[in-house]
């Protein structure tokens, strides 16, 4: 007998994120542990600190398979917060722990990111 | 359905030139700035530059100013990277990408990628 497609159980794993330009950053992660689940969106938010505080994320899809997304326009001296789901037809999983990342300005601009 | 194919990848000695296209479909590819960037074999992704829809002007990241050129033709919906004097550490995939705004919402799309080999 067949079983009926599942959304995804658990986050998506390993989130790291990297700057990689003095506004922009590269988030990649792992498909969901677990049973073969089918993933056909993943939703990346973030926000810098103070805009998470006040509710206020912006919400990235990314299409597909791909594990990789850039962020863009990032402001020098924010920390951003930044965590991910994946989704398919049937529904959205969990999202991961929340990863930060510091943008410093530029003379300083060795990224620092740890998970929270 | 938003796509983006990149072409014109292959092998090329060092010093050599080559141009990549991406060609868009799918969405209003003259609204929306576009991004190129590439990844060498067990390396972390590189940001190239990106491209205004609006001026036209490109913006490169570290490193890419000088050898690399970023154009679009908004009235064929193609995105080009002309890339001139290539060496070796230039080998990767090559991608293009744009992020599309859906009301408060962004949708990013990567196309498939193509592969440059810079080789003797």
């Known amino acids: 007998h067949s079983t009926l497609p599942e959304a995804p159980a658990g986050p998506p794993v390993g989130v790291k994120v990297t700057l990689i330009e003095d506004d922009t950053a590269l988030v990649s992660w792992k498909p969901p542990d677990g049973p073969e689940t089918v993933v056909t969106r993943y939703t990346i938010l973030y926000a810098s600190r103070k805009a998470w505080i006040a509710g206020e994320w912006q919400v990235l899809h990314r299409e597909g398979a791909i594990t990789m997304a850039l962020l863009e326009n990032l402001v020098a001296g924010n920390v951003y917060i930044v965590k991910i789901s994946a989704s398919n037809e049937v529904g959205e999983g969990p999202f991961s722990n929340s990863v930060e990342l510091a943008v410093l300005p530029k003379e300083t601009s060795e990224s620092n990111q740890r998970p929270k | 359905e938003v796509q983006l194919v990149e072409s014109g990848g292959g092998l090329v000695q060092p010093g050599g030139s080559l141009r990549l296209s991406c060609a868009a479909s799918?969405?209003?590819?003259?609204?929306?700035?576009m991004s190129w960037v590439r990844q060498a074999p067990g390396q972390r992704l590189e940001w190239i530059g990106w491209?205004?829809?609006?001026?036209?002007?490109?913006r490169y990241g570290q490193g890419f100013t000088g050898r690399f050129t970023i154009s679009r033709d908004n009235s064929k919906n193609t995105l080009y990277l002309q890339m001139n004097s290539l060496r070796a550490e230039d080998t990767a995939t090559y991608y293009c990408?744009?992020?599309?705004?859906?009301?408060?919402?962004?949708?990013?799309?990567w196309g498939q990628g193509t592969l440059v080999t810079v080789s003797s």
């Open positions: 990408v744009s992020t599309v705004p859906n009301g408060v919402e962004y949708f990013q799309h």
């Open positions: 491209i205004d829809t609006k001026t036209g002007n490109p």
């Open positions: 799918g969405f209003t590819f003259s609204n929306y700035g």
